[in-house]
């Protein structure tokens, strides 16, 4: 069973590990044969996918989805206007930004059109179902001979997010991790100049604007470290899509940035 969906990175994915379980706060069902549970995720408050396991039906059925917002100005029942399909059978619905109201109770109803009494209704708190995009534009600054500062950006949701930074050296198997609040900045006070470090970050819509449990995907990793010249042991390593901007370009401050930033730096 392959459902084509968009992952939190914004890429297409056809694997089943996207389907994260979130129990509805309320569940009602009519008829003897239960309908599959609907699972909704709001991606960066740009769109929302509500999906169900279409293969759980005893025979292929194009289930229909309706939704509304409880006790609000948006309480008019709406039909799904953009279905997602799995093997030509409906398996989800995508709602666009203008149809998403995070702080109103979202009511979603799945129905079997061939048996209208067979329906299931769930109520969801959308602010707890937000998954941000992965952090972007990771940069490293050298604050002192042994101290590094990691910065990153998030698209749109900055103050609503908490973050988890992980780092390790080349010969570490496990990561050291550190929680970071909405300030999206992390300092590593003691860095061994002989080692190569890898950093990565992920973000979560919690706790200021919601109580989401699910993290974003990990950022692309950024590296700092030892495969550098003997003359300057603190020179940043050149890695994959990352390039070094010279100290002159940055007024004496050394900084590792992504290819995307590099173009931006030279063109503006």
């Amino acid at each position: 069973l392959n459902t084509t969906i968009l992952t939190p990175n914004g890429n297409e994915d056809t694997t089943a590990d996207f389907f994260l379980t979130t129990m509805p706060t309320d569940s009602l069902s009519v008829s003897t044969l239960p309908l599959p549970e609907v699972q909704c995720f709001v991606f960066n408050v740009e769109y929302m996918n509500c999906t169900w396991n279409s293969s759980s039906e005893p025979q292929p059925t194009n289930l229909t989805l309706h939704y509304w917002y409880k006790n609000s100005d948006n309480d008019k029942v709406q039909k799904c206007s953009h279905y997602l399909f799995s093997e030509e059978i409906t398996s989800g619905c995508q709602l666009q930004k203008k149809e998403i109201h995070l702080y109103q109770t979202f009511v979603v109803q799945l129905q079997d059109p061939r048996e209208p009494r067979r329906q299931a209704t769930q109520m969801l708190k959308l602010q707890n179902l937000v998954i941000p995009w992965a952090p972007e534009n990771l940069t490293l600054h050298k604050l002192s001979e042994s101290q590094l500062e990691l910065n990153w950006n998030n698209r749109f949701l900055n103050h609503c997010l908490e973050h988890l930074v992980q780092y390790r050296t080349d010969w570490d198997h496990s990561w050291t991790e550190q929680s970071v609040d909405y300030r999206h900045k992390f300092s590593l006070p003691s860095v061994d100049g002989q080692k190569r470090y890898t950093f990565r970050v992920r973000s979560r819509f919690n706790p200021l604007c919601g109580s989401a449990q699910h993290w974003s995907e990990w950022s692309h990793p950024i590296h700092w470290g030892s495969n550098t010249s003997k003359e300057n042991p603190f020179l940043f390593a050149l890695e994959a899509e990352q390039k070094l901007i010279s100290e002159e370009d940055l007024g004496g401050e050394q900084k590792l940035i992504s290819e995307e930033d590099l173009h931006h730096h030279h063109h503006h």
């Epitope: 994915d13 590990d17 992980q166 570490d172 198997h173 496990s174 990561w175 050291t176 990990w218 994959a240």
Partner: antibody
Framework: QVQLVESGGGVVQPGRSLRLSCAAS????????MHWVRQAPGKGLEWVAG????????YYADSVKDRFTISRDNSKNTLFLQMNSLRAEDTAMYYC?????????????WGPGTLVTVSS | DIQLTQSPSFLSASVGDRVTITCWAS??????LAWYQQKPGKAPTLLIY???TLQSGVPSRFSGSGSGTEFTLTISSLQPEDFASYYC?????????FGGGTKVEIK
């Protein structure tokens, strides 16, 4: 669910080569580090080699360094172990294992194994 | 390299017994330790990681403790399905290493 299936084992003479494969499914293979672990008959577990999610770093046990090469093809969801200059002491059941995505990255899924016998 | 020493290597016990297995690391590894169970002819399965965190789906009779250089795996009340071999693994740094194993057999 996660599934790992090793193949390529068999009987081989000392000094010869063998290539093991591990076919992965049920998870986003390109996001996870992978490893080979072996177990000689009646003995304990021995970690052999590991590779980062993108293949950018590879790690080996001293006993196989310069003889074994770990690699992966993320487009085919497959992990490999190229074993050269095989010795009698390489005889073992070879398991591929997937890292769990936690800070400690233990091995949360293992294949059933493929048996390699090095004998003249 | 970090060496792990497991004790005992062999243990005979009865259903209902409380069983403790110890793993020593040759240098401090904080809590970077995992425990695996292996039944004959099968691949290992993860029981505990981060020294004391129970893997999802593992019965609560299994517990882990320790930090630094000494770690223990405890089975509070041995069940028939627990007769197997148990291995510790250090997760701190490469090369990764396993303990020699402890075989738990029926008395």
């Amino acid at each position: 669910q996660v599934q790992l299936v090793e193949s390529g084992g068999g009987v081989v003479q000392p000094g010869r080569s063998l290539r093991l494969s591990c076919a992965a499914s049920g998870f986003n293979f390109r996001n996870f580090g992978m490893h080979w672990v072996r177990q000689a008959p009646g003995k304990g577990l021995e970690w052999v080699a590991g590779i980062l999610y993108d293949g950018s770093s590879k790690y080996y046990a001293d006993s196989v360094k310069d003889r074994f090469t770990i690699s992966r093809d993320n487009s085919k969801n497959t992990l490999f172990l190229q074993m050269n200059s095989l010795r009698a002491e390489d005889t073992a059941m070879y398991y591929c294992a997937k890292e769990e995505d936690t800070a400690m990255v233990p091995f949360d899924s293992w294949g059933p194994g493929t048996l390699v016998t090095v004998s003249s | 390299d970090i060496q792990l020493t497991q004790s005992p290597s062999f243990l005979s016990a009865s259903v209902g017994d409380r069983v403790t297995i110890t793993c020593w690391a040759s240098q401090g590894i904080s809590s970077y330790l995992a425990w695996y169970q292996q039944k004959p002819g099968k691949a290992p399965t993860l029981l505990i990681y981060a020294a004391s965190t129970l893997q999802s789906g593992v019965p609560s009779r299994f517990s882990g403790s320790g930090s630094g250089t000494e770690f223990t795996l405890t089975i509070s009340s041995l069940q028939p399905e627990d007769f197997a071999s148990y291995y510790c693994q250090q997760l701190k740094s490469y090369p990764l290493t396993f303990g020699g194993g402890t075989k738990v057999e029926i008395k």
